[in-house]
Amino acid sequence: TLNSVLNSNAIKNLPPPLGGAAGHPGSAVSAAPGILYPGGNKYQTIDNYQPYPCAEDEECGTDEYCASPTRGGDAGVQICLACRKRRKRCMRHAMCCPGNYCKNGICVSSDQNHFRGEIEETITESFGNDHSTLDGYSRRTTLSSKMYHTKGQEGSVCLRSSDCASGLCCARHFWSKICKPVLKEGQVCTKHRRKGSHGLEIFQRCYCGEGLSCRIQKDHHQASNSSRLHTCQRH
């Protein structure tokens, strides 16, 4: 469907089947140059480049990240920008193209053999480092899920929840995303009160499991707004 016609590297950003694993089936891919749009079940070439607005990285394609288009970061709308290739400068993992991550301000290859130890080291280095939270929105690790042939177990690095095994979701942990357990009845959950507030979480919780929703715990109704405890409760 509407994959970002509206971005600077839209050909790379076509949803599968062009990319492989997923997507709307049966799409015919145009070989013409230009930006491609899978509308209905056909791709169509678009002449013009248009940016795509975003509030967080997840709104962008896997080959993009969300940021202000100007270095100074004006108050205007943020847009999806093309990811940075290997050896390019970065401020967080989402800026680096799939298969790479941000280490010491440079996009480096997330070679499967060395990846786990290095990313943990990078997370430790970047924690508390101002420029790693430059835009104040959520971080999406743009590590290629193709690296993982089996569904991620708890603690595995992921891109989206479909990369994780059943009962797990993909949630932020520092500036990366890992598979965490979907919340069970009675567990504390996060209720986002305002737009964009979820972008401030360093340790993001999963959503509540099937048949549950995140609601104020009965005995906490009298508490002040800031201390209200939300738990997963039956509908």
Epitope: T1, V5, P16, P25, S161, S162, C169
Partner: antibody, heavy 118, light 107 residues
Framework: EVQLLESGGGLVQPGGSLRLSCAAS????????NHWVRQAPGKGLEWVST????????YYADSVKGRFTISRDNSKNTLYLQMNSLRAEDTAVYYC???????????WGQGTLVTVSS | DIQMTQSPSSLSASVGDRVTITCRAT??????LNWYQQKPGKAPKLLIY???NRPSGVPSRFSGSGSGIDFTLTISSLQPEDFATYYC?????????FGQGTKVEIK
Amino acid sequence: EVQLLESGGGLVQPGGSLRLSCAASGFTFSSYWNHWVRQAPGKGLEWVSTIGPSGTSTYYADSVKGRFTISRDNSKNTLYLQMNSLRAEDTAVYYCAESFRSRYFDYWGQGTLVTVSS
Amino acid sequence: DIQMTQSPSSLSASVGDRVTITCRATQSIRSFLNWYQQKPGKAPKLLIYGQHNRPSGVPSRFSGSGSGIDFTLTISSLQPEDFATYYCQQYYDWPLTFGQGTKVEIK
């Protein structure tokens, strides 16, 4: 073929709850953004809520914030809208929609009618 | 929130007519505007995205223009299947908002 099929609509009293479901098929559900858009009888379209592919990003219209909860189960290819504290003004046909991008409504279901009345 | 206002609310036209619908935003939304078509009893359908781009399968008689605050949907030669209600939608910022709709009726 992409298909979105809503269910769960019906008649409910003010203050009551209802849970809508949207079963998706014909595409890889877990890669796409999903939305609820409603249309009151004889009125225009109103965006209600949006959820990201992983379920971690959610957005709500002010008119439903704190009352409605959007969620998804990627293992079941299903989108949900839990509606609590329903009001007469929530009466509408509720459409689910999907898109590769967050702010479009590319494919739509046929809708399910929710009537809030005493 | 960004409000979207369409005009006219309804119009009557004949097959073959050129029809113009306008949509105005309360602030600049750059080119971040979509148009949808909805026929009675049916779900809406994406008609124009990103201000003037047509999804595959949408006839070339539909075109979009404008930027910033004022936008236009033009149907160059109205066909019988075009009688419907048309909505604009901004995607510059959350919350996503629609115009109130323009109903195109047969004269």
